[in-house]
Interface confidence: medium
Amino acid sequence: LRLLDHRALVCSQPGLNCTVKNSTCLDDSWIHPRNLTPSSPKDLQIQLHFAHTQQGDLFPVAHIEWTLQTDASILYLEGAELSVLQLNTNERLCVRFEFLSKLRHHHRRWRFTFSHFVVDPDQEYEVTVHHLPKPIPDGDPNHQSKNFLVPDCEHARMKVTTPCMSSGSLWDPNITVETLEAHQLRVSFTLWNESTHYQILLTSFPHMENHSCFEHMHHIPAPRPEEFHQRSNVTLTLRNLKGCCRHQVQIQPFFSSCLNDCLRHSATVSCPEMPDTPEPIPDYMPLW
């Protein structure tokens, strides 16, 4: 989690002098509670936006927007704390809007936005806006939270962002997997335009079960330049297990831009459909 740093962060608007400050996520009002505190934010909205850095890189950002309730508590509103929590890592980043002038009611509802939290593909975040000062220990909460799921790099607009392109999002391996005979799978995929090795990760499962009955990794050496964008064919000869018939094939590239952390592509072969009643197998093969 980080802030997009391509321009000075501003929160001022007509009728309000405001500055954005880094925050420890532990506002002073927790430690020194106030008697009078503002009400909670209204209509918190989180959207996926895209922002360019000065270097020309494109990043996905969380666009946070909320409004104020039309009550007298805005007289005691001193600012807001914006918190973004990445759910799988528990990493949290906060900023604080510090109001340098008192808010007054005007003919339009007060609206605030902030679009500088850089988010990662395929991650879920909890976004919280706390009005400041925070309430006394037993006071009514004056924050609003929403979860926000960032699409993965398969998403058309995400695909062209810098983090996705760095992890190989423009590579489409177009994987095909076919069963040749009882023991064999043929995996075919398109190589990227980089002389890097690949790994094929095969995991097989019994029909209708989720614990694996076979796993293995296969190393595909780096292709030569003349093989770029060509199809690579891999034949896997497996242990014949009755019922170990559902195969998930995952291809992991090792591009220089993402090394061990490149996007993996996968394809699945389902178990063959079983007829309701077994048909007798003829002793001879008819010619028609």
Partner: antibody
Framework: QVQLQESGPGLVKPSETLSLTCTVS????????WNWIRQSPGKGLEWIGD???????NYNPSLKSRVTISVDTSKNQFSLKLSSVTTADTAVYYC?????????????????????????WGQGTTVTVSS | DILMTQSPSSLSASVGDRVTITCRAS??????LGWYQQKPGKAPKRLIY???SLQSGVPSRFSGSGSGTEFTLTISSLQPEDFATYYC?????????FGPGTKVDIK
């Protein structure tokens, strides 16, 4: 190198459950199949069943209704339970590892061939079913 | 189930003899076959895997051949330590099945 050691009671009463454990040392239990095989006195070898380290099992249909094979990856062990035993279950019971990998590389196309078969065996433990 | 048969069931031979044991499968098993040697009171020991590949550490006088339904184990020059019972094992499909064994003893 990998070694296997069977353990369990040598005498089991008819109708009771035979329980054996195989301890794997010198290597990991992961990414292999682990088998139980038995050999009745003066008879040939009979495959009982196997288990993958993930817990996926395969049993000989002739024994399936009575057999349970389980694995404990934290202890590097796998176990056999055979219920409702009779004197016909008197045998030497072996545990064995199943799995060997050979890769054949072509140019442009790649062949990966998995050869399986019991390559490492325990020394066997005799189980007698008798009242 | 795939039935494995072996012939002969027993044979008597002398040190230095060339010995051939045959294993037949009731249906095609590709080359998914191993050969094992067992001495009294001991666990089987694998000699050959994939029908014709020599297990590491096994003397080169042992060789295997065949594919499909018919397989052969050959001992080119029988040594005193080779007197034992030999089994074939198919692992082409479950249940895996062993041949009944061929006992090789001293003539």
């Amino acid at each position: 190198q990998v070694q296997l050691q069977e353990s369990g009671p040598g005498l089991v009463k008819p109708s009771e459950t035979l329980s054996l454990t195989c301890t794997v040392s010198g290597g990991s239990i992961s990414n292999y199949y682990w088998n139980w095989i038995r050999q009745s006195p003066g008879k040939g070898l009979e495959w009982i069943g196997d288990i993958y380290y993930s817990g996926s099992t395969n049993y000989n249909p002739s024994l399936k209704s009575r057999v349970t094979i389980s694995v404990d990856t934290s202890k590097n062990q796998f176990s056999l339970k055979l219920s409702s035993v009779t004197t016909a279950d008197t045998a030497v019971y072996y545990c064995a590892r199943d799995g060997e990998l050979a890769n054949y590389y072509g140019s442009g196309s790649y062949q990966f061939y998995y050869y399986y078969g019991m390559d490492v065996w325990g020394q066997g433990t005799t189980v007698t079913v008798s009242s | 189930d795939i039935l494995m048969t072996q012939s002969p069931s027993s044979l008597s031979a002398s040190v230095g003899d060339r010995v051939t044991i045959t294993c037949r499968a009731s249906q095609g098993i590709r080359n998914d076959l191993g050969w094992y040697q067992q001495k009294p009171g001991k666990a089987p020991k694998r000699l050959i895997y994939a029908a014709s590949s020599l297990q590491s550490g096994v003397p080169s006088r042992f060789s295997g051949s065949g594919s499909g339904t018919e397989f052969t184990l050959t001992i080119s020059s029988l040594q005193p330590e080779d007197f034992a019972t030999y089994y074939c094992l198919q692992h082409n499909s479950n249940p895996f099945t062993f041949g009944p064994g061929t006992k090789v003893d001293i003539k």
